[in-house]
């Protein structure tokens, strides 16, 4: 006999880095007929919600008005359908961005490299920081971890016009505390004539909807959502 | 067309700092990254650090740590290069370089120390 | 840090003859590669960049290859202006590095 229900998916809208002072909300879908969800916060009971009626709702949601460092962390959500509880999400890290400062980030030998040549992105910021984050625009939610005192190296390559795109970075105060963002760098990746149609650019954002940072969801489907955020947030583990 | 200019030479005394200025024209001052590299006499080439303008950003050769310092003055679009606690080792030809791929390069400054 | 074996250290040619130069990369450098000319009197110009992309104005006998971790510089006929100083220099991981150098001297 069951002695678990499957596990719910997790996941934040618009998405896991959540500017400070913005809303973001954490969903979690689970099965219809579940009576009850509780969202915990770093292991503990955070929120719990009975969706009316069960039977015609598999997912909830958790509302946070303003996004502040005590908010940020990692949060998983369970249900229970009658008597019997599901096993626990996978583990939201749910991030605030845009505290303190401002990093400055540049690219060696420079944003139009030819295909085959090796790329050093560059990230620096002066204040008390050792961990640094690159991030490229886009679907495919890639995110590189560098360390160093007040820069760090983040090398890429030899490159294919599959890393063309828009790159920033971020330094981290802690796991789940980071800086704004900084100005997006273009890499232009090009000679790869024959690949170039295989290696699509990912979609990019406006310069004004960068609050959305790496996702894009064209289908609508709420688990592709959560396995973007997922893919991303391993990443960063 | 791109012009890195830099003082043909200098003598300084042992223990003393010297700062090589290397002028730029012709391209966006704060686009390239500008390398620096040292050359002694009847040697090869090697490797100092580069700067770039716009991010202040920099980056040196572990050997160069503590000896050589990177600046930049955009107003004037003149990358510098200080050398500290200078000794006979450090009498060489420096030279500056324009973009990451050195595209460009300024005809060089001899150093010369000697008491 | 990636080091730069340039060979020949020197060699002797003659006018109109096809000659290479090679330098070998002892970690993947990818197509970050350029070689540089240096004349007598200290002026250094970049011929090859990327590999195997001429700079503009460099005359067309000067080309670029690679084959693995070796890195050459070929030219196809040489002229006197040519007999110079030539390295190679690799700008694919820090600390940049140049090979030792090549003195392409007249037969």
């Known amino acids: 006999q069951q002695q678990t229900l499957p596990k719910p998916f997790i996941w934040a809208e618009p998405h896991f880095m959540v500017p400070k002072e913005k809303q973001v909300t954490i969903c979690c879908q689970g099965n219809y007929g579940a009576v009850e969800y509780q969202l915990h916060f770093e292991g503990s009971l955070f929120a719990v919600d009975r969706p009316k009626p069960p039977e015609r709702i598999n997912k909830v949601q958790f509302y946070i008005p303003d996004m502040n460092s005590r908010m940020a962390g990692q949060y998983s959500c369970i249900y229970r359908v009658g008597e019997l509880w599901s096993e626990p999400s996978n583990l939201l890290d749910l991030v605030v961005t845009e505290m303190y400062d401002t990093p400055t980030l540049s690219v060696h030998p420079g944003p139009e490299v030819i295909s085959g040549e090796k790329v050093t992105f560059y990230c620096r910021l002066d204040t008390a920081t050792s961990m640094f984050l690159l991030l490229k625009e886009g679907r495919s939610s890639h995110v590189q971890r560098g360390y160093g005192k007040v820069q760090a190296e983040f090398p890429l390559g030899p490159v294919t016009t599959a890393h063309r795109g828009t790159y920033r970075c971020f330094g981290s105060y802690n796991n789940h505390a980071w800086s704004f963002p900084s100005e997006p760098v273009k890499l232009l990746v090009t000679g790869d004539i024959e690949n170039t149609s295989l290696a699509p650019e990912d979609p990019t954002f406006p310069a004004d909807t960068w609050g959305t940072y790496l996702l894009t969801t064209e289908t609508g489907l709420q688990k592709d959502h959560a396995l973007w955020d997922h893919t991303a947030q391993n990443l960063l583990r | 067309q791109v012009q890195l200019q830099q003082p043909g030479s200098v003598l300084v005394r042992p223990g003393a700092s010297v700062k090589l200025s290397c002028k730029a024209s012709g391209y966006t001052f704060t686009s390239s990254w500008m390398h620096w590299a040292k050359q002694r006499p009847g040697q090869g080439l090697e490797w100092i650090g580069h700067?770039?303008?716009?991010?202040?950003?920099?980056n040196y050769n572990e050997k160069f740590k503590g000896k050589a310092t990177l600046t930049v003055d955009t107003s004037s679009s003149t990358a510098y290069v200080d050398l500290s606690s200078l000794t006979s080792e450090d009498s060489a030809v420096y030279y500056c370089a324009r973009g990451g791929r050195f595209d460009d390069w300024g005809a060089g400054t001899t150093v010369t120390v000697s008491s | 840090d990636i080091q730069m074996t340039q060979s020949p250290s020197s060699l002797s040619a003659s006018l109109g003859e096809r000659v290479s130069l090679t330098c070998r990369a002892s970690q993947d450098i990818g197509s970050s590669l350029n070689w540089l000319q240096q004349e007598p009197d200290g002026t250094i110009k970049r011929l090859i960049y990327?590999?195997?992309s001429l700079d503009s104005g460099v005359p067309k006998r000067f080309s670029g290859s690679r084959s693995g971790s070796d890195y050459s510089l070929t030219i196809s006929s040489l002229e006197s202006e040519d007999f110079v100083d030539y390295y190679c220099l690799q700008y694919a991981s820090s600390p940049w590095t140049f090979g030792g150098g090549t003195k392409l001297e007249i037969k």
């Open positions: 990327a590999t195997s």
């Open positions: 700067i770039h303008p716009n991010s202040g950003i920099s």
